[in-house]
Structure formats: C-alpha cells, structure tokens
Interface confidence: low
C-alpha cells in the first residue's frame, strides 16, 4: 500500500529535489527559497528565478521552503524559568534553555519548565543531573527515597512502600501526614 500523500507533498514529488511545482501551472517546477527567505512570487516560467525575500526581523525559516510567510520567532517562557541560549536569526529560531544546575521538565512536547537539580541531601548522587532529567539520588541508611528526596525513616508509615527500606525503625514511628486514600 502506498501511504497517502497530502496535496503539497504530491505536487512537490513531481519536481526534482529543491524545486516545487508551480501552483497555477503543473508543468513548471520552481526553485525553492533558501532558508532565511520566503516565497514572495512564484517563478514566471521554466528556468526562471523564484522571487524570494529575506525574512523580516522577528521571523525565520530554518530550511528551504516555498512558504508565503516566515515563521514567527519563539519567545522563551520566563514564567517557566527559561532563558535565551541564542537569539532568533532569519534562518534559526530562538533557542531556549535552563540555567546552570537546572534541568528541563517537559509538560508536553513543546513546553518545558526549568527546575533546580536535586542536591541529594541525606544521600549520594547515583546519576548526575542531565539536560532533561533530574539527579537520581541514592539515600543513606535511615532515609528512603520519595519523589527524589531522601526522607527520614521517622516519616515512614506501615501503609507506605518505604517499610521495606526502613524495616528496623518502622515499629516506633509516629507519622506527621495524613495517608488516607481518596
């Protein structure tokens, strides 16, 4: 089975690489615009130049194209703790990232928030903090790992998973949190 192609893909596939089919005349293949530019006017005929114009400030195209408009530059989300790694240019979108000793937590494919890397207090670093992953901690004796934090076994209750790790201390524990299920 041949996968279904959209109209644009069908039209482009008729022309050699780096060219696209003229929207009003399917016998003409026009040269695509370079990255950093956009399509202002289609080529008037075979072998004639496509009219491409440079993207204006605040917009870009990152690959060869026949877009009628450049794409708007992304803005780094300050409320997510993001910082600008490199500014937008005509041929590259803004690159956003996190500060030193922070990692990216992705809420969705395109939305991330910066959080401080865990310091593994009351434990040791098992895996260092990565660009997209928090530090992985291993806890010292008398502590157990909960939500990437080493918590004292005095906070362990019989109803929680920590009982295996905190077995010797579990008999005389007085919990400080409500562990009722909903």
């Amino acid at each position: 089975l041949v996968p279904h192609l959209g109209d644009r893909e069908k039209r482009d596939s008729v022309c050699p690489q780096g060219k696209y089919i003229h929207p009003q005349n399917n016998s003409i293949c026009c040269t695509k615009c370079h990255k950093g530019t956009y399509l202002y006017n289609d080529c008037p005929g075979p072998g004639q130049d496509t009219d491409c114009r440079e993207c204006e400030s605040g917009s870009f195209t990152a690959s060869e194209n026949h877009l009628r408009h450049c794409l708007s530059c992304s803005k780094c989300r300050k409320e997510m703790g993001q910082v600008e790694i490199s500014s937008c240019t005509v041929d590259r979108d803004t690159v956003c990232g996190c500060r030193k000793n922070q990692y990216r937590h992705y809420w969705s494919e395109n939305l991330f928030q910066c959080f401080n890397c865990s310091l593994c207090l009351n434990g040791t670093v098992h895996l260092s903090c990565q660009e997209k992953q928090n530090t992985v901690c291993t806890c010292h004796a008398g502590f157990f790992l909960r939500e990437n934090e080493c918590v004292s076994c005095s906070n362990c209750k019989k109803s929680l998973e920590c009982t295996k790790l905190c077995l010797p201390q579990i008999e005389n524990v007085k919990g400080t949190e409500d562990s009722g299920t909903t």
Partner: nanobody, 119 residues
Framework: EVQLLESGGGLVQPGGSLRLSCAAS????????MGWVRQAPGKGLEWVSQ????????YYADSVKGRFTISRDNSKNTLYLQMNSLRAEDTAVYYC????????????WGQGTLVTVSS
C-alpha cells in the same frame, strides 16, 4: 498547553463550607502531585495543601489542618479542596498547582477562584 481551571469559590459566612474544583488538561494528570496555594489580598502566595499523584499521601499547612481536605479523581483529571469551618483569614484567591516533587517549586495557570469568608 497545560491548563488548570479552578471553580467553586464564592461568598460564605464564617463556619461555612465550600468545595473547590480544578479541572486539569494538557498533561498526564495521574503522573503529578497536585496542590492548592492561595493569595490573600495584599499578601504573598501561601501553600495550602498537596496530594501525591496516587492520592495516598496528603500534606496540609498548619493553618488549615483538620478543616480542609484535599482529594483527586484521576479518572476525571480533577483536583478538589473541601473547606469546612471557614474563617475570615481563609479569604483569598485559591490556585490549583502542579508539582514534580514534594518540595519542588510549583507552577499554576488560570485565574484562580476567589473565596470570601465574611458575615
């Protein structure tokens, strides 16, 4: 896009009750600890309560312990805050919050819901 929509606020007399709801979308609700924070008029944000992703651990600020109950329904992507024995000092805008760990900074969206306790 991550969205949190708080509702259920209103005017209530001291000693009364309210139930706040937070409808969540745009992220995998069941993966995250959720909570409530509030901002009284002219004051900073105050942490109120938090619940683990599975619902088996709940944490409360001392100021609300014994009066407020946090719960969640993972099948409905909804967080709740049952507020009983309300006091004038509970007057605030209440915001729904997402956490990636117990003491991680939270993030919140939406306008919040205003709770006014007054006679």
């Amino acid at each position: 896009e991550v969205q949190l929509l708080e509702s259920g606020g209103g005017l209530v007399q001291p000693g009364g009750s309210l139930r706040l709801s937070c409808a969540a979308s745009g992220f995998t609700f069941v993966k995250y600890s959720m909570g409530w924070v509030r901002q009284a008029p002219g004051k900073g944000l105050e942490w109120v309560s938090q619940i683990a992703n599975t619902g088996d651990r709940r944490y409360y600020a001392d100021s609300v312990k014994g009066r407020f109950t946090i719960s969640r329904d993972n099948s409905k992507n909804t967080l709740y805050l049952q507020m009983n024995s309300l006091r004038a000092e509970d007057t605030a805008v209440y915001y729904c919050a997402i956490y990636t760990g117990r003491w991680e900074p939270f993030v919140y969206w939406g306008q919040g819901t205003l709770v006014t306790v007054s006679s």
